[in-house]
Amino acid sequence: VPDKTVRWCAVSEHEATKCQSFRDHMKSVIPSDGPSVACVKKASYLDCIRAIAANEADAVTLDAGLVYDAYLAPNNLKPVVAEFYGSKEDPQTFYYAVAVVKKDSGFQMNQLRGKKSCHTGLGRSAGWNIPIGLLYCDLPEPRKPLEKAVANFFSGSCAPCADGTDFPQLCQLCPGCGCSTLNQYFGYSGAFKCLKDGAGDVAFVKHSTIFENLANKADRDQYELLCLDNTRKPVDEYKDCHLAQVPSHTVVARSMGGKEDLIWELLNQAQEHFGKDKSKEFQLFSSPHGKDLLFKDSAHGFLKVPPRMDAKMYLGYEYVTAIRNLREGTCPEAPTDECKPVKWCALSHHERLKCDEWSVNSVGKIECVSAETTEDCIAKIMNGEADAMSLDGGFVYIAGKCGLVPVLAENYNKSDNCEDTPEAGYFAIAVVKKSASDLTWDNLKGKKSCHTAVGRTAGWNIPMGLLYNKINHCRFDEFFSEGCAPGSKKDSSLCKLCMGSGLNLCEPNNKEGYYGYTGAFRCLVEKGDVAFVKHQTVPQNTGGKNPDPWAKNLNEKDYELLCLDGTRKPVEEYANCHLARAPNHAVVTRKDKEACVHKILRQQQHLFGSNVTDCSGNFCLFRSETKDLLFRDDTVCLAKLHDRNTYEKYLGEEYVKAVGNLRKCSTSSLLEACTFRRP
């Protein structure tokens, strides 16, 4: 019988008492085969973290700073359940640390040196750790003691709880630096008052502070937020302009064998029976013998953290950067305006080799990082292990939902002004063999399908979106008799046709021979009835253009396109017979790397782009013998986006809506994780 006990870790006598009450009340409402609670008492949260890592306990609730400690080796814990605040309809699991300024003050984030600062309190998250962590490498050296460096950075501050004797400048705006509400500038409201009164130039608070202190929109409009990209935004745009997004209070467990499903089952049942306004007997979110025992008293319930989410992703790049800076205190030798090398994310070993070749030729301007799937690459870019990669539109959507931004677009048509003119897009098509003359768009049920990969534009999102509108369910593996859609579940009929060997079968990378445009077409040639690809795929792989044995004798005339009106047309008539227009592939990065990725890639394409005529003796960035490694092989240049610099603007309303509709069919664990952070 599996052990269904969750050993909860308590850090005080009062918590242990509440834990025992929790245990007893759960026993009274949950059947004997359901989850149960046991209580383990430790002296501190850090002791609880160590106990969970050592399998002496299973769960504890922590604030963000401790979630970071819990994630670090050798603890390796992960977030499994989040407390939420507000209502069940609009649950808040995060708050945003922001920098508020007066509208007419005219400076940006990179111009804070010499300004006057208002903090909620020394050592507090939004008011100190996050802003000072993010500014850490701009502080004057020596950076230890930190208070002295901060005092020398700003021209005056109010940092309640600081030592006014040793660091008088930190108390200049609030004599004495009192560490309670007796100091009018203490806490969130106090720090905002410090700004409002004109004592300071910037207040480091959380996003809700300004709304709690100024009910009137006209009053709020006198203030703005400083963004990390050195722009400003209105105070209600905090989701797009903050210093960090911080989880409020989170249950953590072991990453391996951590009982995360059991913990969720326990807490879900606990909130049903003992949540807000549920029971007089025992209340989960109430602490008669103290404050915030086991859980925050202000919590309204729990939400399950998506399994794909590790602590780094949960805490977010900005928060992790800030805390790491404060803890480790390491900065680059001297901050320069020079761009650091761009870390390109390469999928599997084929792309890695091409990336290494690029790295060698770029003389270190490009470095390479490997991942097994596109989603793993996106996650690495999110957390700073990698910086950039070029993505199909379907993944631009996921990357955008995860906070990344498009920076340059692949262009596929030769033009005089290629780099300045991003194209409207390419065509997603359905290709069949001419010999299968009875096959149309309307009788695909039961046929064998070939897809570039799950989640990609031409190979999945467009055809499956159209199909979903027709069949109104997500069971595409039942609609087609079998197929190859790399990235599907291995036991799905949509992996049956794939050709990868062993663990590589149906993997969404080049180790699966039927992956990508060329792979999906090969699948049609060798096994399938229909391939969902781009309009250039057939001509690029016929007429001897692809020297591989399977392709070298193919003829374009042996293939036709399926049109949505039930007719068929020759391959060259794609403009009048396609499924939809697809946005071109685009390079994505984090917002903080946008300028450098743009600059370095434009230099690189001038050196190794389509102006290089002899690719047999020189490195060519946009060539890999039909394998589409790192970039599509038909890329002519990488083009500026001008104002299409968010994923929504880049992909266009129609495509975003189409992918949004398919979301209910999504198997993307990364998309689930990112929409948890930003619904």
Epitope: H350, E357, N361, L629
Partner: nanobody, 117 residues
Framework: QVQLVESGGGLVQPGGSLRLSCAAS????????MAWYRQAPGKQRELVAG???????TYAGSVKGRFTISRDNAKNTVYLQMNGLKPEDTAVYYC???????????WGQGTQVTVSS
């Protein structure tokens, strides 16, 4: 197809030196960038050093200042001079010309380097 033959490996004490050679034959007109990789037991193959046709070089951080890559275009050979060898440099060393490797998955036999006292 380009054929590559690596040589020069062996057993050496920590702090010692070795010079690896890699001779290319076949369709060598297509050779542009060449590189040395290494693979230690149970680890991924990793880039050690690379050199372009014009002689521009790049090194992995762990070997910078100790290893030097060079090439002799007339002899179609690429070299890796390894000084200050450490036990963690123990691996099979492979040379590649990229045009073969990432299109055809072509690798030579490699040459074993063992650094041990």
């Amino acid at each position: 197809q380009v054929q590559l033959v690596e040589s020069g490996g062996g057993l050496v004490q920590p702090g010692g030196s070795l010079r690896l050679s890699c001779a290319a034959s076949g369709s060598i007109f297509s050779i542009n960038t060449m590189a040395w990789y290494r693979q230690a037991p149970g680890k991924q193959r990793e880039l050690v050093a690379g050199i372009t046709r014009s002689g521009t070089t790049t090194y992995a951080g762990s070997v910078k200042g100790r290893f030097t890559i060079s090439r002799d275009n007339a002899k179609n050979t690429v070299y890796l001079q390894m000084n200050g060898l450490k036990p963690e440099d123990t691996a099979v060393y492979y040379c590649t010309d990229y045009s073969s490797s990432y299109y055809q998955d072509y690798w030579g036999q490699g040459t074993q380097v063992t650094v041990s006292s």
